[in-house]
């Protein structure tokens, strides 16, 4: 009893073609069939009397075949026989192309043969490999072969039986004198204990066969010296099984909560300082000259759109300057040289004269705005939502969808700082990155609008007929200095037309 072993080493099919010359599609996925039979002077078709074996697909076109004897014995190929080795043989090796995974003959293309070789000769039992190379017009196969005795068989023809064993009760061969000689990887008096993979952890690993390292629960790695972290652990490690010790900047049971948004995402722009303020939350402290949630906006005095009536704003070192369109003048282009006679109101706006025809005001229809009703209302164009809030048009109105941590109609309130209503006298609270700010109503000032100040009584333009208005700071009242031809506390009466009193 013995084994004919065939070691395929290299197959060359540079053009990737079948024996017919037809190119393989998609490349020659090559497997081999081997037929071993009794010696024939001319090797001819017929039964493979000594055995047959097939390989899986071993490569495409040209490839080397690696030795895989330790991993299951695919190469060398094994052709066992149960008789006294006769010392002669015939061998047929066929290379076939399999386009798919099914290697049965009927699943192959009709011209699947890549090459076939046939050799015959003498071969004695022994450990030495005979190297051979066969070349056809299109292919070359390099291989080696030998005959060795089966376990427990010895002699020139593998006909002498000896009780060596390789099972649960021992793993040894018979020496010429009958003593046990342990097979590689085994130890002990009867060669029953496997020698595990070198370095396999003594406590966390074990083996049931040589060069193996099987891990106990909670351990992994080639040598079973790496713990398995808690299932789902994202940014963490373990030192004992099932732990999840978080890496720096991460938290939570599975270390999947980002506690260091600043470092991981660098959200602050323009050299701003980033401060973590909770899971996936941060605050940017802007450098002078920048604003916005991420300090992404450059401050400009024109940002508040101070120029009215379509005036264009130009930034200057000491402030700004309004360039007024024709028909307007003043610091903010707030004065008009037009009157209703000039039909200044667009989009169906109706004109109302003011100051006895010296000025006018446009009453705009719905969906239009501007001094002359020249702008279509998009209540979100002015970006009214603060702190990164999202402006949403809702028909005739608008609303702001606030980022977490902000509230108020315009997301102007930081939940934490403005929640206690710190601004006195109806002041509006604004939550800033480093605290809050109060915008005070007329007549009040101070950090919290706690200081009462005088009111500019002239702000409402109470004087008629181009009279000059002066504010009396001591009484918060106004005085009108009438031009020639007008009298009255507001210069509302022309001279010569006395007021008509009701009594």
């Amino acid at each position: 009893s013995g084994v004919f072993q065939l070691q395929l080493q290299e197959f060359i099919n540079e053009r990737g073609v079948l024996a017919s010359g037809r190119p393989c599609e998609p490349g020659c996925r090559t497997f081999f069939r081997v037929c071993l039979k009794h010696f024939q002077a001319v090797v001819s078709p017929g039964p493979c009397t000594f055995g047959t074996v097939s390989t899986p697909v071993l490569g495409t076109n040209s490839f080397a075949v690696r030795d895989d004897s330790s991993g299951g014995g695919r190469n060398p190929l094994q052709l066992p026989f149960n008789f006294t080795w006769p010392g002669t043989f015939s061998l047929i090796i066929e290379a076939w192309h399999a386009p798919g995974d099914d290697l049965r003959p009927e699943a192959l293309p009709p011209d699947a043969l890549i090459s076939k070789i046939a050799i015959q000769g003498s071969l004695a039992v022994g450990q030495n490999w005979l190297l051979d190379e066969q070349t056809s017009t299109l292919t070359r196969l390099r291989y080696s072969y030998r005959v060795i005795c089966s376990d427990n068989y010895y002699g020139d023809n593998c006909s002498r039986l000896c009780k060596k064993r390789n099972d649960h009760f021992g793993h040894y061969v018979c020496q010429p004198d009958g003593n046990l000689s342990c097979l590689p990887g085994w130890t002990g008096e009867y060669c029953q204990q496997p020698i595990c993979l070198s370095g396999c952890h003594e406590q966390n690993g074990y083996c049931s066969k040589p060069a193996e390292c099987l891990c106990r629960p909670g351990w992994q790695g080639r040598l079973c010296n790496e713990c398995i972290p808690h299932n789902g652990c994202r940014h963490g490690t373990c030192s004992t099984p099932w732990q999840c010790t978080c890496d720096e900047g991460w938290g939570g049971l599975f270390c999947d909560q980002d506690l260091n948004y600043c470092t991981h995402h660098s959200p602050c722009k323009n050299g701003a300082t980033c401060s973590n303020s909770g899971q996936r939350s941060y605050t940017c402290t802007c450098r002078p000259g920048y604003t916005g949630v991420d300090c992404e906006l450059e401050l400009s005095e024109c940002d508040s759109n101070p120029c009215r009536n379509g005036g264009s704003c130009k930034d200057q070192e000491d402030g700004y300057h309004c360039l007024c369109p024709p028909g307007y003048y003043g610091l903010h282009c707030e004065h008009s040289t037009l009157s209703c006679a000039d039909s200044p109101c667009f989009n169906g706006g109706s004109c109302r004269e003011r100051n006895q025809g010296a000025n006018y005001a446009c009453e705009c229809p719905p969906n239009f705005t501007g001094s002359n009703c020249e702008k279509k209302v998009d209540r979100c164009t002015s970006n009214p939502c603060a702190n990164g809030g999202q402006c949403l048009n809702r028909g005739p109105s608008r609303m702001c969808r606030c980022r977490p941590g902000f509230t108020g109609t315009y997301c102007e309130l930081h939940v934490s700082d403005c929640a206690r209503n710190p601004c006195a006298h109806g002041g509006t609270c604004h939550d800033l990155e480093n605290g809050l700010m109060c915008t005070c109503p007329a007549g009040f000032s101070g950090r919290r609008c706690e200081v009462r100040t005088s009111i500019d009584a002239c702000a409402s333009s109470p004087c008629f007929n181009r009279a000059t208005c002066y504010t009396d700071l001591s009484t918060d009242t106004f005085v009108c200095n009438c031009p020639y031809g007008f009298v009255g506390s507001r210069c509302e009466f022309p001279v010569g037309l006395p007021p008509s009193f009701p009594w």
Epitope: A19, P45, P99, P110, K116
Partner: antibody, heavy 119, light 106 residues
Framework: EVQLVESGGGVVQPGGSLRLSCAAS????????MSWVRQAPGKGLEWVAD????????YSADSVKGRFTISRDNSKNTLYLQLNSLRAEDTAVYYC????????????WGQGTMVTVSS | SYELTQPPSVSVSPGQTASITCSAD??????VSWYQQKPGQSPVLVIY???MRPSGIPERFSGSNSGNTATLTISGTQAMDEADYYC?????????FGGGTKLTVL
């Protein structure tokens, strides 16, 4: 019983078209490559085309390339040959044959269907 | 393209051995099939892979292939063996058939 039955032959003018069918039974049609082979009157056998079991690969002889198309419908166990731009030299008995995988040859043949191209 | 060359005719007496050859360059590198066709009938596969017989084909049919020549041998030829015989192999464009050999049993 393993059987292949061709149909669709007939007389057609040069430049005309025909579609031949081959109904298979008695074996797992979708597992095998199939072929068409023709034989002109008094002449030898000439391979025309073959197609893989799943229909992904198809080949044809140079003499018919661009004119004849082989196809199959595994759900109907049927092989087809579409013949276009027919010429007088295409006159032949057309056989449908099962191509044995792995260089076994054509192990099952139909009875053949005659195609005559004549004006 | 690849050409398989067969003798147009071979004659043999009943009971004698008939040999039909098929030649091409390096034909021994390929597997050859042989077909028998009787008048008015479809071809029948009689030998595949050089010398293997399908079931139902009599043992008197055998084949071999080496070098540049494949041979179909019919030993103990019978009258019923009279037919056309075609060899077949493959080339880069597809299947290739020999021109055919008419076997006459005298």
């Amino acid at each position: 019983e393993v059987q292949l039955v061709e149909s669709g032959g007939g007389v057609v003018q040069p430049g005309g078209s025909l579609r031949l069918s081959c109904a298979a039974s008695g074996f797992t049609f979708g597992s095998h490559w199939m072929s068409w082979v023709r034989q002109a009157p008094g002449k030898g056998l000439e391979w025309v085309a073959d197609i893989s079991n799943d229909g992904r690969y198809a080949y044809s002889a140079d003499s018919v390339k661009g004119r004849f198309t082989i196809s199959r419908d595994n759900s109907k166990n049927t092989l087809y040959l579409q013949l276009n731009s027919l010429r007088a030299e295409d006159t032949a008995v057309y056989y449908c044959a099962k191509a044995g995988g792995g260089n076994v040859g054509f192990d099952i043949w139909g009875q053949g269907t005659m195609v005559t191209v004549s004006s | 393209s690849y050409e398989l060359t067969q003798p147009p005719s071979v004659s043999v007496s009943p009971g004698q051995t008939a040999s039909i050859t098929c030649s091409a360059d390096n034909l021994g590198n390929q597997y050859v099939s042989w077909y028998q066709q009787k008048p008015g009938q479809s071809p029948v596969l009689v030998i595949y892979q050089d010398g293997m017989r399908p079931s139902g084909i009599p043992e008197r049919f055998s084949g071999s292939n080496s070098g540049n020549t494949a041979t179909l041998t019919i030993s103990g030829t019978q009258a019923m063996d009279e037919a056309d015989y075609y060899c077949q192999a493959w080339d880069s464009s597809g299947a290739v058939f020999g021109g055919g050999t008419k076997l006459t049993v005298l």
